[in-house]
């Protein structure tokens, strides 16, 4: 807490300008009017204040707005945002995407801080859903943002927002998250033609069920191995050798290199060795010829 001291004669700041960088902390406290600071916040970012000086400016704004800053001030916080605590940010009502962008710019290139996480949470809750423009903005600054959300939070993403998602935004998503996102993507891209649809849906396929993979196998999509390896094991297991061959097209040869890894390993164990041999890849571990395969899960469902 800075002591209350009278402003020396001739030092009262008539405006926020570069001369203030030569003021000591107590002089800033005593000689800068908080209301003036609030109306001229847009100038602060253009002045090379030190961290210590920014502390004093924050203290002045806190006194002026004990219930939380108005958006007109928040939008121009600039580097002062780095001085805010999550508790400060919880008092804000940020509704403008421009304000959000301005504050994210301050933290650009750095890990998502608790302050930024709180800001985003406040903003998204205020909007009621994660709309396309917001998602566009957030993934531009934090490509991993989408995958940091819980499946419950992702459920509030409208299908229209999926258009803003880039493949790299899904890199760190786990299967539970893709389970939520895939149906939304399927809905969002449903009016696209075959090849265009596959390009868009590809990065979401980690959430696709067996029937959708079977349908894709009929469309000459030539799925690459990296995508295939991210598919749900339970969705891959029921696919026949012929379906996998159609699904992968020329990439089917890559199965050999992945035969010890999931889901390929588990899928091989479910196939007849005879069928695997038709691929000519030397895949081993299928069901030997002459063995009877009982699908117990089907039997249980019928009983």
């Amino acid at each position: 807490e800075v002591e209350k001291t009278a402003c020396p004669s001739g030092k009262k700041a008539p405006e926020i300008d570069e001369s203030l960088i030569f003021y000591k902390k107590w002089e800033l406290e005593a000689c800068v009017d908080a209301a003036l600071l609030a109306t001229q916040m847009d100038r602060v970012n253009a002045i090379p204040f030190t961290y210590e000086q920014l502390d004093v400016l924050k203290h002045k704004l806190d006194e002026l707005y004990p219930q939380g800053y108005p958006e007109s001030v928040i939008q121009h916080l600039g580097y002062l945002f780095l001085k805010m605590s999550p508790e400060d940010i919880r008092k804000w009502n940020v509704t403008s995407l421009e304000t959000l962008k301005a504050l994210l710019e301050v933290n650009k290139g750095h890990e998502m801080s608790p302050q930024v996480a709180t800001l985003i949470d406040r903003f998204v809750k205020g909007r009621g859903q994660l709309d396309k423009d917001t998602l566009d903005t957030l993934t531009a600054f934090y490509p991993g943002y989408l995958c940091s959300l819980s499946p419950e939070e992702l459920s509030s993403v409208p299908p229209s927002s999926i258009w803003a998602v880039r493949p790299q935004d899904l890199d760190t998503c786990d299967p539970r998250q893709l389970d939520v996102l895939y149906p939304k993507a399927r809905l969002a891209f449903q009016n696209m033609n075959g090849s265009e649809y596959f390009v868009k849906i590809q990065s979401f396929l980690g959430g696709a069920p067996t029937e959708d993979l079977k349908a894709l196998s009929q469309q000459n999509v030539s799925m690459d191995l990296a995508t295939f390896m991210k598919l749900r094991t339970d969705a891959v297991l029921p696919l026949t050798v012929a379906e996998v061959q159609k699904l992968l097209g020329p990439h089917v040869e890559g199965l050999k290199a992945e035969e010890r890894h999931r889901p390929v390993r588990d899928w091989i164990l479910r196939q007849r060795q005879d069928d695997l041999d038709t691929l000519g890849l030397g895949l081993q571990g299928g069901i030997p010829n002459g063995y009877l395969v009982l699908d117990l899960s089907m039997q249980e469902a019928l009983s």
Partner: nanobody, 122 residues
Framework: EVQLVESGGGLVQAGGALRLSCAAS????????MGWFRQAPGKEREFVAA????????YYADSVKGRFTISKDNAKNTVYLQMSSLKPEDTAVYYC???????????????WGQGTQVTVSS
């Protein structure tokens, strides 16, 4: 790992000119404000100039205003200090530094280059 590498120092006659360069990693360059400082023998490190990442604002120490120009090339992740009308009192080791904020205080700069010697003879 953050790396700042200065170059361009040397010996020059009073009234002459030099251009210092500071190459940074792309991540540092795009997320930091960049500053130039100098330190003469037996003296404290002194602020010379800074360029703000947000808005591109520039600030100079009074001692170099009108003679030095700070600039940056985003494509090359490089910040420059063009020095002209050099004086013997400009003799020092010049350092490039990066900060999360736009500040005139050396304390606020997290990463520093190794420095490049500038000597101005009379």
């Amino acid at each position: 790992e953050v790396q700042l590498v200065e170059s361009g120092g040397g010996l020059v006659q009073a009234g002459g000119a030099l251009r210092l360069s500071c190459a940074a990693s792309e991540r540092t360059f795009s997320s930091s404000s960049m500053g130039w400082f100098r330190q003469a023998p037996g003296k404290e490190r002194e602020f010379v100039a800074a360029i703000n990442r947000i808005g591109g604002h520039i600030y100079y120490a009074d001692s170099v205003k009108g003679r030095f120009t700070i600039s940056k090339d985003n494509a090359k992740n490089t910040v420059y200090l063009q020095m002209s009308s050099l004086k013997p009192e400009d003799t020092a080791v010049y350092y490039c530094a990066s900060s999360r904020i736009y500040s005139h205080s050396a304390r606020d700069y997290d990463y520093w280059g190794q420095g490049t010697q500038v000597t101005v003879s009379s």
